[in-house]
């Protein structure tokens, strides 16, 4: 009679994470006597998958009956597959022995591959928020995925972005891989409702790429515009100064009033505008009492932008000329923070 | 439902035969090797030798070997364990276990004069 | 035959406290092959964990098992009421077939 063979006809099996493989494995014999056993691996650090008569296989099932008269399939299904479970499997017949059994022959093994879907991705931005015309780096990472093959895009508002530089780890083969890329983009006064996406292709996503966002919202901070102005006269004696709090965001903004350097008033932005770019404006009042005045005032609207250092605007209020509207001061836009002030 | 149900407490005198049996259910006996294990009070677990159901082949640890015999019935699913010679060294409770996973709920052998 | 020594023979711990238990095996016993279980007394011994880190059914996930050749170790995270017992190592990697002599857990 010709000697056993041990046949395992896949060379290699393709199953997504999940899933249950199937391992085919038949003897062309049934003799010698003894038991077939599963091994990923070989030599001596081979792992045992399945042993037909003993141990604890929770996820191994048969897929015909070892115990059946004549029976010479070998082949099992193993159950809820993971990208650890990658490797090479080995169908191997074993002889009855004494006190072990022996090994008698091995098959030429199937090599199982695991297509494991990528996380979702993560994207995060800078810790600290940035003014426009300045660069931020946004990262993107996803991880878990197997085979290493990956595609990983950056967009802006639908615009494919070209400045970023990706990595997917490990370099060498393993069960599973991870990818981690930076993207710089530069901030514009119109990104508060901008948003940055990272999307992410793999074979097991069937051309439906997954995408992790960030709005630029989160990111950006965009310093205000000051502009400090009298108004006509209210009374006799006094005049209605305003402060113009223009194109700003967040809405974190304290405005302080001083008169001649002293602090008149102080106020938060509450009621506040919003642009439609998502900036927000606001305007404060003052009233002053030109009576109280024997000399020229200085006025300064001082605005405080989001815990950033002061900038303030000022404007010249003449005691001696009768309180008729001035023009606006030219001072130096500064960047301040959005709050609403009411005397 | 796999479960393992062995026969009833017994009492021995020295030089006596015991002979407890392990019925299974839940699966089907010629699956996997049955090992029976000794347990004497207070002490460890000691592998006594082990069946393998479909065919009768049999290994016995070197310490019970000749003494024990390990025997199954594949028509009503139940192993045996005998020991024979008894002393009072075998005063134990033994269990039946298959795939290291499914154990009886022991039989305790008593051994007296 | 593989000759497998646990350690320590009995370990005093309070509830919440993390317990680690030790198995040495005479000769290298592939991971694959040693399964540790848990007994309290009157009862049969159950599987906690196979293939040296693989938790059985049902096991809480505060056990955990760890090791290769010759040294492995069970770890309980922080120990619950329920696990003071006894605990035992095994391999069935050659014949015979052996167990530790087993660590008793007992509350301090």
């Known amino acids: 009679e010709e000697e056993l063979q041990v046949i395992q006809p896949d060379k290699s099996v393709l199953v997504a994470a999940g899933e249950t493989a199937t391992l085919r494995c038949t003897a062309t014999s049934l003799i010698p006597v003894g038991p077939i056993q599963w091994f990923r691996g070989a030599g001596p650090g081979r792992e045992l998958i399945y042993n037909q008569k003993e141990g604890h296989f929770p996820r191994v099932t048969t897929v015909s009956d070892l115990t059946k008269r004549n029976n010479m399939d070998f082949s099992i299904r193993i159950g809820n597959i993971t990208p650890a479970d990658a490797g090479t499997y080995y169908c191997v017949k074993f002889r009855k022995g004494s006190p072990d059994d022996v090994e008698f022959k091995s098959g030429a093994g199937t090599e199982l591959s695991v297509r494991a879907k990528p996380s979702a991705p993560v994207v995060s931005g800078p810790a600290a928020r940035a003014t426009p015309q300045h660069t931020v780096s946004f990262t993107c990472e996803s991880h878990g995925f197997s085979p290493r093959d990956i595609t990983l895009k950056w967009f802006k508002n639908g615009n494919e972005l070209s400045d970023f530089q990706t990595n997917v780890d490990p370099v060498g083969e393993s069960v599973s891989y991870s990818i981690h890329s930076t993207a710089k983009v530069v901030l514009t006064r119109e990104d508060v409702h901008s948003q940055v996406i990272c999307e992410v292709a793999h074979v097991t996503l069937q051309g439906d790429p997954l995408r992790g966002t960030a709005n630029l919202s989160e990111t950006i901070r965009v310093p205000p515009t000051l502009e400090v102005t009298q108004q006509p006269v209210r009374a006799e004696n006094q005049v209605n100064v305003t402060c113009q709090v223009r194109k700003f965001y967040p809405q974190r903004l304290q405005l302080t009033w001083l008169e001649n350097g002293n602090v008149s008033r102080t106020e938060t932005a509450s009621t506040v505008t919003e642009n439609k770019d998502g900036t927000y404006n606001w305007m404060s009042w003052l009233l002053v009492n030109v009576s109280a005045h024997r000399d020229d005032v200085k006025l300064t609207c001082q605005v405080e932008h989001d815990g950033q250092p002061a900038v303030s605007k000022s404007h010249d209020l003449k005691v001696s000329a009768h309180p008729k509207e001035q023009g606006s001061n030219t001072a130096a836009e500064n960047t301040g923070s959005n709050e609403r002030n009411i005397y | 439902e796999v479960q393992l149900v062995q026969s009833g407490a017994e009492v021995k005198k020295p030089g006596a035969t015991v002979k407890i049996s392990c019925k299974v259910s839940?699966?089907?006996?010629?699956?996997?090797?049955m090992h029976w294990v000794q347990q004497a009070p207070g002490k460890g677990l000691e592998w006594m030798g082990r069946i393998d159901p479909e065919d009768g082949e049999t290994k016995y640890a070197p310490k019970f070997q000749g003494r024990v015999t390990i025997t199954a019935d594949t028509s009503t699913d139940t192993a045996y364990m005998e020991l024979s010679s008894l002393r009072s060294e075998d005063t134990a409770v033994y269990y039946c276990?298959?795939?290291?996973?499914?154990w009886g709920q022991g039989t305790t052998v008593t051994v007296s004069s | 035959e593989i000759v497998l020594t646990q350690s320590p023979a009995t370990l005093s711990l309070s509830p919440g406290e993390r317990a680690t238990l030790s198995c040495s095996a005479s000769s290298s016993v592939s991971s694959s092959y040693l399964y540790w279980y848990q007994q309290k007394p009157g009862q049969a011994p159950r599987l906690l964990i196979y293939s040296t880190s693989n938790l059985a059914s049902g096991i809480p996930a505060r056990f955990s098992g760890s090791g290769s050749g010759t040294d492995f170790t069970l770890t309980i995270s922080s120990l619950e009421p329920e696990d003071f017992a006894v605990y035992y190592c095994?391999?069935?990697?050659?014949?015979?077939?052996?167990f530790g002599g087993g660590t008793k857990v007992e509350i301090k």
């Open positions: 276990a298959t795939s290291w996973a499914y």
């Open positions: 839940g699966f089907n006996i010629k699956d996997y090797y």
């Open positions: 095994h391999q069935w990697s050659s014949y015979p077939r052996t």
